[in-house]
């Protein structure tokens, strides 16, 4: 039975040209995290494998930085970066947990962070 929950940074906004940290946290489970995938729609941005460490997809190497922790930092944001981002926790023995973050990249200087929320 999967008992864990993923807490994410929820709906967030950031300024064009700036950077943003995408964060997810898996709690309420003793399952071992074997890998975390970060995806944007159907594109793989990065993985963090428990044995091997981080790998950033070549097409995102210039604008994506690993961390802090299992999070992901997006840099030099453009309006095209607006959209859904997913953290996918592969765990043993529970299986897969997925968290969703919606990022809006704004032209203006008004960019406020949304509240945290949980996905069971």
């Amino acid at each position: 039975m999967m008992t864990g929950t993923i807490e994410t940074t929820g709906n967030i906004s950031a300024e064009k040209g700036g950077s943003i940290i995408l964060q997810c946290h898996l709690s309420s489970t003793t399952a071992q995290v074997t890998q975390v995938n970060w995806e944007q729609q159907d594109q793989l941005l990065a993985i963090c494998n428990a044995d091997l460490g981080w790998h950033i997809s070549p097409s995102f190497k210039d604008r994506v930085a690993p961390g802090p922790g299992l999070g992901l930092t997006l840099q030099s944001l453009t309006v095209n970066d607006t959209g859904e981002y997913f953290c996918i926790y592969h765990t043993y023995p529970d299986g897969t947990y997925t968290g969703r973050i919606f990022l809006e990249v704004l032209e203006s200087s008004v960019a406020e962070h949304g509240a945290r929320f949980q996905i069971p």
Partner: antibody
């Protein structure tokens, strides 16, 4: 005694194929992620490929992607590396290496085989 | 990929003296969530496979003599052999695993 023993190396022409094997003993093989690491003559070490204990996760270095295939048979306590479209720059000693997992993942290789030499030459 | 740069390429040290090997990574290998540096040191003697000496930058692997010690954090690391013994003649490699594994070019330690 914990041991890894590689075999299957040899001389092969460019474009040819070779299958390396690594026989494991002295530990619960299926519980450990395994790797192939190579060392060209007189050179340093290069990580080649990784496979998780259940074979569910596999990765390759860019230099071998699309040409090499890693696999394992936990029932036989064996690790394999199928090498196709071999090039002169693949000439190296190939080591199988185990991931250290004694406490929490250190991402280091704690047990290495003695290596098997692969020579790609016409 | 993270580039690991070792210095010096070779080192000649008298028996009983200290040997110091440096390793620099092109990016930090410090993982913030557990405060671990994903940096390992290996010893490779002629005709033998590498042997793990140190992981997490400073933790000695079981059975490794205490004359071997590792230090450093972030991007700069050091392996020290406090009192060189004849059996320590080897090539020493650092390896990062913050990103997928890469190794330094090696440092050859000889007796002066």
């Amino acid at each position: 005694e914990v041991q890894l023993v590689e075999s299957g190396g040899g001389l092969v022409q460019p474009g040819g194929s070779l299958r390396l094997s690594c026989a494991a003993s002295g530990f619960t093989f299926s519980s450990y992620s395994m790797n192939w690491v190579r060392q060209a003559p007189g050179k340093g070490l290069e990580w080649v490929s990784y496979i998780s204990g259940s074979s569910s996760t596999i990765y390759y270095a860019d230099s071998v992607k699309g040409r090499f295939t890693i696999s394992r048979d936990n029932a036989k306590n064996s690790l394999y590396l199928q090498m196709n479209s071999l090039r002169a720059e693949d000439t190296a000693v190939y080591y199988c290496a185990r991931h250290r997992i004694a406490d929490s993942p250190s991402r280091a290789f704690d047990i290495w085989g003695q290596g098997t030499m692969v020579t790609v030459s016409s | 990929d993270i580039v690991m740069t070792q210095s010096p390429d070779s080192l000649a040290v008298s028996l009983g003296e200290r040997a110091t090997i440096n390793c620099k990574s092109s990016q930090s290998v410090l993982f913030s969530s557990n405060n671990k540096n994903y940096l390992a040191w290996y010893q490779q003697k002629p005709g033998q496979p590498p042997k793990l000496l140190i992981y997490w930058a400073s933790t000695r692997e079981s059975g490794v003599p205490d004359r071997f010690s590792g230090s450093g954090s972030g991007t700069d690391f050091t392996l020290t052999i406090s009192s060189l013994q004849a059996e320590d003649v080897a090539v020493y490699y650092c390896q990062q695993s913050y990103f997928f594994p890469t190794f330094g070019g090696g440092t050859k330690v000889e007796i002066k």
